[in-house]
Interface confidence: low
């Protein structure tokens, strides 16, 4: 018996061929011997089956001795053995219809789980294998779960259903809702304007929700809410904003915040959360601010950084075009009785300068100048 696999909602064509290459009488029946369709001369006739409005044939092929049964908008319950009667012969075709659906919305938050459910006819024992856009293979039976979705899981999932050495492929488009970056770090000299950006890694026609930026300053004992906002159809409106610092927020996506001045008391890390309408859970992005200050007090030239720096970062003080006078894996360095000239304070990671502040040291009878 020939086996044909079909997909729910698709169209399938079951073939039936006579030895005579001409139009002769044929009938298609189901396993209950109920007529589905057949011919009377050059006319298509239909029986009382449930397929009535979805069954068809190709009259253009009858003259060649081909009498296909076409079933449109396939349903799982269309799975059956179909019998073609032609020339006193019976051709049997077993049709198995499968459906594969995401049992939740196909727009999922990063970290959430995706469950794909296979609808299959009774008595079948299919296996399912899905391949994610990043090439991960996931194998399962009637249900297939992927926990902790990542940004790279966005895109087309290709799922293969295997049954009786036959296979049918499904494609499901999944959108993982997330920020483009899980974390970012901004390095600024004291007094500079700070720009924080939170680009989303997906596009949807309408985006509605609410968000908040909580900030943990390095010098503070507890975190505080810096700003809360609403998002309506991609338009941003601020609800509450702290008075210190005086944050400003852009009115359009991507979410964009401006801190007028980088000051040591603001150095630290924040967590922006975004709750989207009709979604459980929130999107998160961490943002870090490192602030540098170079000062000269009497005979002491000091360079300090505040904020979340990694232990491998190097802080150096050097006279322009000279070797570093002092270089340490610490958050403050200083030089006593510095020579006159332009001094550079450098924060670097494996030789790459992340932040630089210059301070001019004048001869001892003058006061220092900070450019």
């Amino acid at each position: 018996k020939k086996v044909v696999l079909g997909k729910k909602g698709d169209t399938v064509e079951l073939t039936c061929t006579a030895s005579q290459k001409k139009s002769i009488q044929f009938h298609w029946k189901n396993s209950n011997q109920i007529k589905i369709l057949g011919n009377q001369g050059s006319f298509l006739t239909k029986g009382p089956s449930k397929l009535n409005d979805r069954a068809d044939s190709r009259r253009s092929l009858w003259d060649q001795g081909n009498f296909p049964l076409i079933i449109k908008n396939l349903k799982i319950e269309d799975s059956d053995t179909y019998i073609c009667e032609v020339e006193d012969q019976k051709e049997e075709v077993q049709l198995l219809v499968f459906g594969l659906t995401a049992n939740s919305d196909t727009h999922l938050l990063q970290g959430q789980s995706l469950t794909l459910t296979l609808e299959s006819p009774p008595g079948s024992s299919p296996s399912v294998q899905c391949r994610s856009p990043r090439g991960k293979n996931i194998q399962g039976g009637k249900t297939l779960s992927v926990s902790q979705l990542e940004l790279q899981d966005s895109g087309t999932w290709t799922c293969t259903v295997l049954q009786n050495q036959k296979k049918v492929e499904f494609k499901i488009d999944i959108v993982v809702l997330a920020f483009q970056k899980a974390s970012s770090i901004v390095y600024k000299k004291e007094g500079e304007q700070v720009e924080f950006s939170f680009p989303l890694a997906f596009t949807v026609e309408k985006l509605t929700g609410s968000g908040e930026l909580w900030w943990q300053a390095e010098r503070a004992s507890s975190s505080k809410s810096w700003i809360t906002f609403d998002l309506k159809n991609k338009e941003v409106s601020v609800k509450r904003v702290t008075q210190d610092p005086k944050l400003q927020m852009g009115k359009k996506l991507p979410l964009h915040l401006t801190l007028p001045q980088a000051l040591p008391q603001y150095a630290g890390s924040g967590n922006l959360t975004l709750a989207l309408e009709a979604k459980t859970g929130k999107l998160h992005q961490e943002v870090n601010l490192v602030v540098m200050r170079a000062t000269q007090l009497q005979k002491n030239l000091t360079c300090e950084v505040w904020g979340p720096t990694s232990p491998k970062l190097m802080l150096s003080l050097k006279l322009e075009n000279k070797e570093a006078k002092v270089s340490k894996r610490e958050k403050a360095v200083w030089v006593l009785n510095p020579e006159a000239g332009m001094w550079q304070c450098l924060l670097s990671d494996s030789g790459q300068v992340l932040l630089e502040s210059n301070i001019k040291v004048l001869p001892t009878w003058s006061t220092p100048v900070q450019p």
Partner: antibody
Framework: EVQLVESGGGLVQPGRSLRLSCAAS????????MAWVRQAPGKGLEWVAT????????YYRDSVKGRFTISRDNSKNTLYLQMNSLRAEDTAVYYC?????????????WGQGILVTVSS | DIQLTQSPSSLSASVGDRVTITCRAS??????????MQWYQQKPGKAPKLLIY???NLASGVPSRFSGSGSGTDFTLTISSLQPEDFATYYC?????????FGQGTKLEIK
């Protein structure tokens, strides 16, 4: 009998292009994913690219992304690999393979291979 | 990328010997109790030939003296009694993740 026959290889200068073809027979071509695997002279095997049964999805190894394009013509039972901006390190025997799937994907039939030499 | 390391890189054996080749993956190649590991045989100037798929399944037409075992990160190809036609290079290959990767190969020579 499954047969995969590659053609289109040869000597090409760095930076130039070449198009490999693979004529398939002995099986229903449109039911199978296909892939290209290469082997540099005296070296091991290296997967290059894969295309799904209907051509809608393609995968590439990082070193060829943006330079190579895998495609297929199911009406002609033919697989292609368009190779642009060729480099000396692309010199290899290129095998056309059929990609079968049980629980994993694997290469169950291979062509005889075609040599691509990139040299000035 | 998942790295596959085969050992030994080469070995000499005689007809009738039992031979074992191992393949170690840098991370697990298992999904839902399926081990996505294959073994191929390649003779000089010829295309590779599939021997074993999914760690232990024998490919069509492959003699039963070939067998595969292992799970997770450690896999083995065993030839129970070497035949003259078995002298070749053997490769393991994972298909858990893109890019598909192969081991560096094990050359089996006549002693």
């Amino acid at each position: 009998e499954v047969q995969l026959v590659e053609s289109g290889g040869g000597l090409v200068q760095p930076g130039r292009s070449l198009r490999l073809s693979c004529a398939a027979s002995g099986f229903t071509f449109s039911n199978y994913g296909m892939a290209w695997v290469r082997q540099a002279p005296g070296k091991g095997l290296e997967w290059v690219a894969t295309i799904s049964y209907d051509g809608s999805i393609t995968y590439y190894r990082d070193s060829v992304k943006g330079r190579f394009t895998i495609s297929r013509d199911n009406s002609k039972n033919t697989l292609y690999l368009q190779m642009n901006s060729l480099r000396a390190e692309d010199t290899a025997v290129y095998y056309c393979t059929r990609e079968e799937q049980y629980s994993s994907w694997y290469f169950d039939f291979w062509g005889q291979g075609i040599l691509v030499t990139v040299s000035s | 990328d998942i790295q596959l390391t085969q050992s030994p890189s080469s070995l000499s054996a005689s007809v009738g010997d039992r031979v074992t080749i191992t393949c170690r993956a840098s991370q697990s190649v298992s999904i839902s109790s399926h081990d996505l590991m294959q073994w191929y045989q390649q003779k000089p100037g010829k295309a590779p030939k599939l021997l074993i798929y999914d760690a232990f399944n024998l490919a069509s037409g492959v003699p039963s003296r070939f067998s595969g075992s292992g799970s997770g990160t450690d896999f083995t190809l065993t030839i129970s009694s070497l035949q003259p036609e078995d002298f070749a290079t053997y490769y393991c290959q994972q298909s858990k993740d893109d890019p598909y990767t192969f081991g560096q190969g094990t050359k089996l020579e006549i002693k």
